[in-house]
């Protein structure tokens, strides 16, 4: 009786289950009543990373340095290659297919979280205390100066993108 | 019925090449894969490999990769088996046979100087 | 490469005995065993394939049987026509490999 459903890692093919071809291989030939299905090992830059009866191999993909993209993880039979971006850069998408470059908080904001090859950087506004007055990718919001610290008094009141100004206290004569 | 005929024995010499056809009939040829198996004097058989007309996929024996080319040409539904750099001990009935079940009637090939 | 032995390797008997060829792999193989009849001076011929199935046109005296790395052969009643060199191979993994043959004579 020829089956209907074929094991794991098989499939049905003129009513007979053939093996699939592992990772990393491709279908050269079906199985038949003489022979084992026939597969062969992916060539240089091709992959395959399921069980398949794939008769082509997939291309490795292509960190094009054009688009900012290098090689995070090269590729093998098996795996696809994992680009990333260049320092200073992220990637547009999960698929990681080209880089923009990082964002920079504007003066008033500082870094919440620093960019990486695969996330922008978060910017957040700073808080009342707290200041940041350049447009920068690392920066967080600086607090601001202390004036009763260091025996100063507040001659200038900070903002968001400025320090506050210390000077001397007044003296009575 | 199923016919494979091969072309007519051969005599080489050692270091040159020898290309053997095998034209198909009574079965749609592209369905089988065509296998080459060679057999030397007194001995028993070899697998050299097969390939699949379909899609022209040949697989090949590592004994003779790099020696042995597997071609087929549909529109007249022949198989070929080309064999590089004879030697004296790749003297042999050379057959194609129809994904292992059906045999041509073997090409002999002589090596000799 | 699976490496196929067969034993014996020539055997003589007499017409209507039975007679029993054995082929052993070096693994396993599953069912990817098939036997070939090759008489003197003749084209080899499939008798058997998949470890028990005739091929067309196949007298029902022989059959095969085994499982995994070992199988057999059977002639249930020698024929003078059976006189011939039998060889097993194995279709499961390549290269595809055949086994040194087993020649058979009448006695």
């Known amino acids: 009786e020829p089956p209907t459903a074929c094991r794991e890692k098989q499939y049905l093919i003129n009513s007979q289950c053939c093996s699939l071809c592992q990772p990393g291989q491709k279908l050269v030939s079906d199985c038949t009543e003489f022979t084992e299905t026939e597969c062969l090992p992916c060539g240089e830059s091709e992959f395959l990373d399921t069980w398949n009866r794939e008769t082509h191999c997939h291309q490795h993909k292509y960190c094009d340095p054009n688009l900012g993209l290098r090689v995070q993880q090269k590729g093998t039979s098996e795996t696809d290659t994992i680009c990333t971006c260049e320092e200073g850069w992220h990637c547009t998408s999960e698929a990681c297919e080209s880089c923009v470059l990082h964002r920079s908080c504007s003066p008033g904001f500082g870094v919440k979280q620093i960019a990486t090859g695969v996330s922008d950087t978060i910017c957040e506004p700073c808080p009342v205390g707290f200041f940041s007055n350049v447009s920068s990718a690392f920066e967080k919001c600086h607090p601001w100066t202390s004036c009763e610290t260091k025996d100063l008094v507040v001659q200038q009141a900070g903002t968001n993108k400025t320090d506050v100004v210390c000077g001397p206290q007044d003296r009575l004569r | 019925q199923v016919q494979l005929v091969q072309s007519g024995a051969e005599v080489k010499k050692p270091g040159a090449s020898v290309k053997v056809s095998c034209k198909a009939s009574?079965?749609?040829?592209?369905?089988?894969?065509m296998d080459w198996v060679r057999q030397a004097p007194g001995q028993g058989l070899e697998w050299m490999g097969d390939?699949?007309?379909?899609?022209?996929?040949?697989i090949y024996n590592l004994k003779f990769k790099g020696r042995v080319t597997l071609t087929v040409d549909t529109s007249t539904s022949t198989a070929y088996m080309e064999l590089r750099s004879l030697r004296s001990d790749d003297t042999a009935v050379y057959y194609c046979?129809?994904?292992?079940?059906?045999w041509g009637q073997g090409t002999t090939v002589t090596v000799s100087s | 490469d699976i490496q196929m032995t067969q034993s014996p390797s020539s055997l003589s008997a007499s017409v209507g005995d039975r007679v029993t060829i054995t082929c052993r792999a070096s693994?396993?193989?599953?069912?990817?065993l098939n036997w070939y009849q090759q008489k003197p001076g003749k084209v080899p011929k499939l008798l058997i394939y998949?470890?028990?199935r005739l091929h067309s046109g196949v007298p029902s005296r022989f059959s095969g049987s085994g499982s995994g790395t070992d199988f057999t052969l059977t002639i249930s009643s020698l024929q003078p026509e059976d006189v011939a060199t039998y060889y097993c191979?194995?279709?499961?993994?390549?290269?595809?490999?055949f086994g040194g043959g087993t020649k058979v004579e009448i006695k």
């Open positions: 191979q194995q279709g499961n993994t390549l290269p595809y490999t």
């Open positions: 390939i699949n007309p379909k899609n022209a996929g040949t």
């Open positions: 693994q396993d193989i599953s069912n990817y």
């Open positions: 998949y470890i028990s």
């Open positions: 009574g079965y749609t040829f592209t369905d089988y894969n």
């Open positions: 046979v129809r994904r292992l079940d059906y």
